[in-house]
């Protein structure tokens, strides 16, 4: 660090004074020197180091007519917003010829009310759930003692006697405010007031009660909500593609969820208008006057298969001697599951009904008994899934086939009631 030499008398006729004050203070240090000839540039030192970017001014006043006469030089250093880093010993420095001169030191100190480095923040917490709040303050002067207040009531008998930087709260059952006071020899500073909003706990044990192809009934156990009754719960369901990848804790589904509200109690909800035989993910959150709980994790569920909702379409049945040829198309109505096959039933006027499982084929040739003289033969077809048979088609009469004639096609409507057949007995 530059040092003044004693070979010549110091040119300084005014030295920096002292400033002590609170953070944010605007202050000015001054030094004055009298020199002969060209006035030098005045530099400022803090703790022996030159301040390269000092906010300083310089005035030069000649004391005579000639440039070689004496000059008075005044330099002022501005401290705009006093911080801890500004404190220290300040001096002016000039280079005159081959010599360096430094003024007597002035001192800048920080002393005032405590200053908060950290204050309690607003937050939401679940009812009866532990959490921590932070507060940190410094002087000078030190020491700084903290006093926590909850709803404006001190949590200790005196500053410094209770928790200091961190306040552990074992749980709240109502929305509360917290602040901290910082005390030092200069007085007291009060932090901002943090509002801790008590929300319901996350619901637990979300589970399926019953399943239908297009609806699921779900139930859950509500969490504690403090002094605030639950007003409703919200259930979300989202289609889960195999590759969708909703993880247990993933915050949001990849598509817009189906949202339903449930009055509570009971903590149960029937989710309708779902697709059969479809995987979903569901979650629930419950709300009080203070706001909603966090969502439960996504629960994978699946609607069961249903039976097809309509009969096969465009059934045609033609007879040629002792053979009957029957074909049809897949039902237009929703299958509500995976199509496993078709059942076919045929019956004559005075003969017992014959029931066949055709599998996934959409045509069959029937070998009729005897000479084929069975009268008024009719055929019915139904599609089935793992959940059972769909509705049977209306009976289609077997028509005699004549060469050169197109096979007749019957447009059939849905059978209102399904015949009760047992499993094939053949």
């Amino acid at each position: 660090a530059p040092r003044g030499t004693q070979a010549e008398e110091s040119p300084f006729v005014g030295n920096p004074g002292n400033i002590t004050g609170a953070r944010g203070l605007t202050g000015t240090l001054r030094c004055q020197l009298q020199v002969q000839g060209e006035p030098p540039e005045v530099h400022w030192l803090r703790d022996g180091q030159i301040l390269e970017l000092a906010d300083s001014t310089q005035t030069q006043v000649p004391l005579g007519e000639d440039e070689q006469d004496d000059w008075i030089v005044v330099s002022q250093l501005r401290i705009t917003s006093l911080q801890l880093s500004d404190t220290g010993q300040y001096q002016c420095l000039v280079f005159l010829g081959h010599q360096t001169f430094v003024s007597q030191p002035g001192y800048v100190g920080l002393e005032g009310l405590p200053y908060f480095l950290e204050e309690p923040e607003d937050r939401t917490v679940a009812a009866n759930t532990p959490f921590n709040l932070s507060c940190q303050a410094q002087g000078p002067p030190e020491p700084v003692d903290l006093l926590w207040l909850q709803d404006a009531v001190p949590l200790a008998t005196a500053p410094g006697h209770g928790p200091q930087r961190s306040l552990h709260v074992p749980g709240l059952n109502k929305t509360s405010s917290f602040s901290c006071e910082a005390h030092n020899a200069k007085g007291v500073t009060t932090s901002r007031t943090a509002t801790i909003t008590v929300l319901p706990q996350q619901p637990r044990n979300l589970h399926l009660v019953s399943r239908q192809p297009t609806e699921l009934e779900v139930a859950w156990t509500p969490g504690l909500s403090g002094i605030y009754p639950l007003t409703h719960c919200t259930l979300q369901a989202v289609l889960s593609d195999d590759g969708m990848g909703i993880q247990a804790g993933e915050p949001d589904p990849p598509e817009e969820p189906l949202t339903s509200q449930a009055s509570v109690p009971p903590h149960q909800l029937r989710l309708g208008s779902l697709h059969p035989h479809t995987p979903y993910h569901i979650r629930v959150a419950c709300t009080s006057s203070q706001g909603p709980s966090s969502w439960t994790h996504w629960l994978p569920v699946e609607t069961p298969e249903g039976v097809p909702l309509g009969p096969p379409e465009n059934i045609s049945a033609t007879r040629n001697g002792s053979q009957a040829f029957v074909h049809w198309q897949e039902p237009r109505a929703p299958l509500q599951g995976t199509l496993l096959g078709y059942r076919l039933a045929y019956q004559g006027q005075d003969t017992p009904e014959v029931l066949m499982d055709i599998g996934l084929r959409q045509e069959v040739t029937l070998e009729l008994q005897g000479d084929g003289s069975v009268s008024n033969l009719t055929v019915c077809v139904a599609a089935y899934t793992a959940a059972g048979d769909g509705p049977w088609s209306l009976p289609v009469p077997l028509e005699a086939w004549r060469p050169g004639q197109a096979q007749p096609v019957h447009q059939l409507v849905k059978e209102p009631s399904t015949p009760a057949f047992s499993w094939p007995w053949w």
């Epitope: 400033i19 004050g21 203070l25 605007t26 300083s56 005035t59």
Partner: antibody, heavy 121, light 107 residues
């Protein structure tokens, strides 16, 4: 004799720009901080900003930060206030003022001892 | 920012009266307070700096006092040329802020 003379005021549309000048005489601009203060019609005084002409450092009120720029030319002994993106609420008489320099070794705060006559924007 | 609250906002007085204007800071500003006088259509004039120091050329009937948050400007014997608006200003922190002004009128 110490004197500050403002010029450059006038009528301008919202969103427009204006440059005010503050010509100093009787003292060197390098030796003090120069402040700009404004006064809306029938209202009180509002500080706009200051400049250290010797270093070129400027400091602004939040209400003008990013829109106004204070500069100085020590060779012309003149300070400037460049006002851009002007708003209706910037309507005022604008004064430049010299900061009073005491002769003690230190001081806390400051006062403004010489003021210009003001220019209406 | 520090708020400076002046009172009263206006007062009526007669020549020769003793007039007191007060200014309260929203937080401690030590002695970093100045007082100015402004007449209509004119620039402000410095009267007092550092709370209690009389600026050069200002008549001695003007005086200032106070420290911390409460400050006072006193005119010991009001003269005809003293009818004007008076402003306090703190410069302890930046930005400096002014009081809203006190208008001294002739009774």
């Amino acid at each position: 004799e110490v004197q500050l003379v403002e010029s450059g005021g006038g009528l301008v549309q919202p969103g427009g720009s204006l440059r005010l000048s503050c010509a100093a005489s009787g003292f060197s601009l390098s030796g003090s901080w120069i402040h700009w203060v404004r006064q809306a019609p029938g209202k009180g005084l509002e500080w706009v900003g200051w400049i250290n002409p010797y270093r070129g450092y400027a400091y602004y009120a939040d209400s003008v930060k990013g829109r106004f720029t204070i500069s100085a030319d020590t060779s012309k002994n003149t300070a400037y206030l460049q006002m851009n993106s002007l708003r209706a609420e910037d309507t005022a008489v604008y004064y430049c003022a010299r900061e009073y320099s005491g002769w003690g070794g230190s001081s806390v705060g400051y006062a403004m001892d010489y003021w210009g006559q003001g220019t209406l924007v | 920012d520090i708020q400076m609250t002046q009172s009263p906002s206006s007062l009526s007085a007669s020549v020769g009266d003793r007039v007191t204007i007060t200014c309260r800071a929203s937080q401690d500003v030590s002695t970093a307070v100045a007082w100015y006088q402004q007449k209509p259509g004119k620039a402000p004039k410095l009267l007092i700096y550092s709370a209690s120091f009389l600026y050069s050329g200002v008549p001695s009937r003007f005086s200032g006092s106070g420290s911390g948050t409460d400050f006072t400007l006193t005119i010991s014997s009001l003269q005809p040329e003293d009818f004007a608006t008076y402003y306090c200003q703190q410069s302890y922190t930046t930005p400096p802020t002014f009081g809203q002004g006190t208008k001294v009128e002739i009774k």
